[in-house]
């Protein structure tokens, strides 16, 4: 069956060193446990996180995301997932693409992460 992939309405903001959550879901909602779900970074399609055959596929991750990501699947039965990225870096800023693949049918949604420096301040005078 066909579906759309829905990402966040607006850019997501995070501070360097914090963790951030990138939500993604299918519409209409349905069980996505058996689907392939993933995030990659355009334009070079570097894999941020991949979930396939009911498991996280750590081996496919780009090195800069290894050990820093977690797919929250509490609501995957309704087609809703969240990617948690820990220890956010400046290099994480920019575009991410989330996709759901059901057999040969795939849809995706773009989202943007803005990363800010928690120690940034303007020097007086």
């Amino acid at each position: 069956g066909q579906f759309r992939v829905i990402g966040p309405r607006h850019p997501i903001r995070a501070l360097v060193g914090d963790e951030v959550e990138l939500p993604c879901r299918i519409s209409p909602g349905k069980n996505a446990t058996g689907m392939e779900v993933g995030w990659y970074r355009p334009p070079f399609s570097r894999v941020v996180h991949l979930y396939r055959n009911g498991k996280d596929q750590d081996g496919d991750q780009a090195p800069e995301y290894r050990g820093r990501t977690e797919l929250l699947k509490d609501a995957i039965g309704e087609g809703k997932v969240t990617l948690r990225i820990r220890n956010v870096r400046f290099s994480d800023e920019g575009g991410f693409t989330c996709f759901f693949r059901d057999h040969s049918y795939q849809e995706e949604a773009a989202m943007e992460l803005k990363v800010e420096d928690p120690f940034y301040w303007v020097s007086p005078g």
């Epitope: 759309r4 879901r25 519409s27 609501a75 809703k80």
Partner: antibody, heavy 120, light 106 residues
Framework: EVQLLESGGGLVQPGGSLRLSCAAS????????MSWVRQAPGKGLEWVSA????????YYADSVKGRFTISRDNSKNTLYLQMNSLRAEDTAVYYC?????????????WGQGTLVTVSS | DIQMTQSPSTLSASVGDRVTITCRAS??????LAWYQQKPGKAPKLLIY???SLESGVPSRFSGSGSGTEFTLTISSLQPDDFATYYC????????FGQGTKVEIK
Amino acid sequence: EVQLLESGGGLVQPGGSLRLSCAASGFTFSSYAMSWVRQAPGKGLEWVSAISGSGGSTYYADSVKGRFTISRDNSKNTLYLQMNSLRAEDTAVYYCARDYWLDSDYFDYWGQGTLVTVSS
Amino acid sequence: DIQMTQSPSTLSASVGDRVTITCRASQSISSWLAWYQQKPGKAPKLLIYDASSLESGVPSRFSGSGSGTEFTLTISSLQPDDFATYYCQQVYIYSTFGQGTKVEIK
């Protein structure tokens, strides 16, 4: 089965306070944002407040900002609305609703509502 | 704030009629729109979300369409159980509801 059960409504004088509670069951409470929506007698629906699944982010309608406080206790699967400095125009049925997923989202499950009457 | 305007406010129809309710947003909300049905003394019930996705368990005679600022809810063949008040809701920036459309028996 998802269930939401509000309590705490009643009659209160203008300027008074009230705390509403919403007991949730049938889903992973901490994974969902939650909201309060109200409906004045014979009127339409008005979104009041929302809170993220972790409780770390809260949102308010301008009409209640500074007077109402939304909170949640994920260990008790319970949502709260503390209402202070109540006014006659706050009289309404207050519904607790599960956000479809994220903060300020669609509402896929609703409680039965609890009536708050502000009158002297 | 984003304002939502529904039309008509009241609609008189008969069983079997095709019914259309319109909702206009004061600015573009993409497809971040839902439709609810409410009966007297009851909580609202989600019918449509993301402008056109049918909520699980909702009869297929209900459908939604539109994007940007103009949206419609259509009931293809009105049933006795469908006489109620219908609300649209935007969730693009916080959440606001339309004023409601009451569908009554002609």
